[in-house]
């Protein structure tokens, strides 16, 4: 058993049929010695008396808010949560496996630039009695500071019969140099509590590997005289690291109709303009990627050909 | 503000083209190592990230773009003294810091070159003959060093009398290649920045 936060404790249980469970001793936070009784949750049934209460925790029915009283007055609370371990593996029931970039990916993180700011998000089908708390650091043995905000519900989607909820959190490395060469990864830890179930999820990454620039901005078309060709130009996104001659991007320019199966014109360039062939009912799209370290491409920025 | 983007042209900053070749060569070699050594811990997640130039050179600090010198977090240590002549500086009014930067890059390349050559000598003794260093990568390191053209003491190639542990050597190769790729990215950024300045 360990303390998650004040008056909230996590009991780690091997979860299998007829498992013996864990013996837990609760102590009432009071100078009083006599006349103390214990109850669980909203029940008025007295579980025991005395300053300490010993319980055998085997299942979720044994978890919850234990309260010690004296003469009708509440002295203190202890909330017990369960953390299940099945076949040596901690449970991951609360969050959905996003399976990208690989299986068992519960947390996904992205950074728009090298400033040390990044966003992580996760998915769940649970809508109520759910809380998250996020911590992060650079390295684990001698951790350097990363400050994370509160996790918030950022999107709701309908997937078949199920509703899916996306939560996200923003974090900022306390002293980040955009030009630095990372040797210690960022560690992100998410504590998830659903009712009386506790789970924790972690992710480890270098900022350089989670870079995904914003789409290029200000796309403009200029038809070329006596030609089917069009000059398309754009600018670096505002959120990208500066100076741009140091943090350079490369671009992919594509002309395509509405369907992905349609024919297309595609060209890659390091410049902020390109010449392509425009077709009726097609769109010109441009996306960006770090020129020197191939992490993710940005989303497309698009303008219609006409 | 979009600073001009360079294309490798002989008339331009002479080291840019070489640095682009360097990044390409080390990336290819790293990819080859990952594929060939698939049953060794050779991915970014599996290896320890070591920097053989740590406390010996200060390329990131010495080559910091002017725009980032206002960032406190970027200014850990900037007291280094290197030789200040080099052909990449040709026909330009260059600051002391730029000379310091390029000589730091030169020292990096020299250290990696020695490490890679020593390692290759060991790998050539491996009866499995599983992986060797790409001669193109070694040639590209050499070309960039020549373009930088700094005079510096020769670092003797390390020779080891004990029987090489090929497993450890291959893991060390992965560690070196990952670190060198990151440094090659920095070098490429620096050359692009200097070319645009």
């Amino acid at each position: 058993i360990w303390e998650l936060k004040k008056d909230v404790y996590v009991v780690e249980l091997d979860w299998y049929p007829d498992a013996p469970g864990e013996m837990v001793v609760l102590t009432c936070d009071t100078p009083e010695e006599d006349g103390i009784t214990w109850t669980l949750d909203q029940s008025s049934e007295v579980l025991g008396s005395g300053k300490t209460l010993t319980i055998q925790v085997k299942e979720f029915g044994d978890a919850g808010q234990y309260t010690c009283h004296k003469g009708g007055e509440v002295l203190s609370h202890s909330l017990l949560l369960l953390h299940k371990k099945e076949d040596g593996i901690w449970s991951t029931d609360i969050l959905k496996d996003q399976k990208e970039p690989k299986n068992k990916t519960f947390l996904r993180c992205e950074a728009k630039n090298y400033s040390g700011r990044f966003t992580c998000w996760w998915l769940t089908t649970i809508s109520t009695d759910l809380t998250f708390s996020v911590k992060s650091s650079r390295g684990s043995s001698d951790p350097q500071g990363v400050t994370c905000g509160a996790a918030t519900l950022s999107a709701e989607r309908v997937r078949g019969d199920n509703k899916e909820y996306e939560y996200s959190v923003e974090c900022q490395e306390d002293s980040a140099c955009p030009a630095a060469e990372e040797s210690l990864p960022i560690e992100v830890m998410v504590d998830a509590v659903h009712k009386l179930k506790y789970e924790n999820y972690t992710s480890s990454f270098f900022i350089r590997d989670i870079i995904k620039p914003d789409p290029p901005k200000n796309l403009q078309l200029k038809p070329l005289k006596n030609s089917r060709q069009v000059e398309v130009s754009w600018e670096y996104p505002d959120t990208w690291s500066t100076p741009h001659s140091y943090f350079s991007l490369t671009f992919c320019v594509q002309v395509q109709g509405k369907s992905k199966r349609e024919k297309k014109d595609r060209v890659f360039t390091d410049k902020t303009s390109a010449t392509v062939i425009c077709r009726k009912n097609a769109s010109i799209s441009v996306r960006a990627q770090d020129r020197y370290y191939s992490s993710s491409w940005s989303e497309w920025a698009s303008v219609p050909c006409s | 503000r979009n600073l001009p983007v360079a294309t490798p042209d002989p008339g331009m900053f002479p080291c840019l083209h070489h640095s682009q070749n360097l990044l390409r060569a080390v990336s290819n070699m790293l990819q080859k190592a990952r594929q060939t050594l698939e049953f060794y811990p050779c991915t970014s997640e599996e290896i320890d990230h070591e920097d053989i130039t740590k406390d010996k050179t200060s390329t990131v600090e010495a080559c910091l773009p002017l725009e980032l010198t206002k960032n406190e977090s970027c200014l850990n240590s900037r007291e280094t003294s290197f030789i200040t002549n080099g052909s990449c500086l040709a026909s330009r009014k260059t600051s002391f810091m730029m000379a310091l930067c390029l000589s730091s890059i030169y020292e990096d390349l020299k250290m990696y070159q020695v490490e890679f050559k020593t390692m290759n000598a060991k790998l050539l003794m491996d009866p499995k003959r599983q992986i060797f260093l790409d001669q193109n990568m070694l040639a590209v390191i050499d070309e960039l060093m020549q373009a930088l053209n700094f005079n510096s003491e020769t670092v003797p190639q390390k020779s080891s009398l004990e029987e090489p542990d090929f497993y450890k050597t291959k893991i060390k190769l992965c560690i070196l290649l990952h670190a060198f790729r990151i440094r090659a990215v920095t070098i490429d950024r620096v050359m692009s920045y200097l070319n645009a300045s």
């Epitope: 089917r228 060709q229 490369t250 199966r261 349609e262 024919k263 297309k264 014109d265 595609r266 060209v267 890659f268 360039t269 390091d270 010449t275 062939i277 077709r279 009726k280 | 294309t7 490798p8 042209d9």
Partner: antibody, heavy 118, light 107 residues
Framework: QVQLVQSGAEVKKPGSSVKVSCKAS????????LHWVRQAPGQGLEWMGW????????EYAPKFQGRVTITADESTSTAYMELSSLRSEDTAVYMC???????????WGQGTLVTVSS | DIVMTQSPLSLPVTPGEPASISCRAS??????LHWYQQKPGQAPRQLIA???QSISGVPSRFSGSGSGTDFTLTISSLQPEDFATYYC?????????FGQGTKVEIK
């Protein structure tokens, strides 16, 4: 399976014209760009131009501009390349090639040898 | 027009050995570079798209690298069926242009 089948070999006199055909099978004809590339005996490849069969848009290499005409007939899934004012240096194998991507080629025809000789 | 220069023009290789063909562009073409194989009397066959993207059905011994002006096609271990002429082609701008070709011959 996608296939491009070209018309047979031709012998032409200098100053005349030649029209080579390329019939596509497999896949929808208008879903692909169609190019013509030539190869003189023992020489390399030389791009001549492309057509978008969907709308008849064409683009020609400056070297052939004014001398080459590329057309397409959607009803027969056939593209044509006509080269006029032939000279001896136009003796080559003429190949059609196609792709959903405009600027490179994934399927090629077998080639048509055009010999220009007086 | 962008001029593509291949080297060497002829490459004698022992079967089972690796081979590398170089292609250089007269100006920067990013990764807009494609490789083809042509055997005598046959049409070209696509090997690599956009400098390094492998094509389905092409053996994994063929790989491409490069960007900007310098590109390489590598055959990790030459098989008897690989003896042919190889062409690079730029797609950065029209007109599309090819290298002169490199003939890989049995040593």
């Amino acid at each position: 399976q996608v296939q491009l089948v070209q018309s047979g070999a031709e012998v032409k006199k200098p100053g005349s014209s030649v029209k080579v055909s390329c019939k596509a099978s497999g896949g929808t004809f208008s879903d692909y760009y169609l190019h013509w590339v030539r190869q003189a005996p023992g020489q390399g490849l030389e791009w001549m131009g492309w057509i978008d069969p969907e709308n008849g848009d064409t683009e020609y290499a400056p070297k052939f501009q004014g001398r080459v005409t590329i057309t397409a007939d959607e009803s027969t899934s056939t593209a044509y390349m006509e080269l006029s004012s032939l000279r001896s240096e136009d003796t080559a194998v003429y190949m059609c090639a196609r792709n959903k991507e405009l600027r490179y080629f994934d399927v090629w025809g077998q080639g048509t040898l055009v010999t220009v000789s007086s | 027009d962008i001029v593509m220069t291949q080297s060497p023009l002829s490459l004698p290789v022992t079967p089972g050995e690796p081979a590398s063909i170089s292609c250089r562009a007269s100006q920067s073409i990013s990764i807009n570079l494609h490789w083809y194989q042509q055997k005598p009397g046959q049409a070209p066959r696509q090997l690599i798209a956009f400098a390094s993207q492998s094509i389905s059905g092409v053996p994994s011994r063929f790989s491409g690298s490069g960007s900007g002006t310098d590109f390489t096609l590598t055959i990790s271990s030459l098989q008897p069926e690989d003896f042919a002429t190889y062409y690079c082609q730029q797609s950065n701008s029209f007109p599309l242009t090819f290298g002169q070709g490199t003939k890989v011959e049995i040593k």
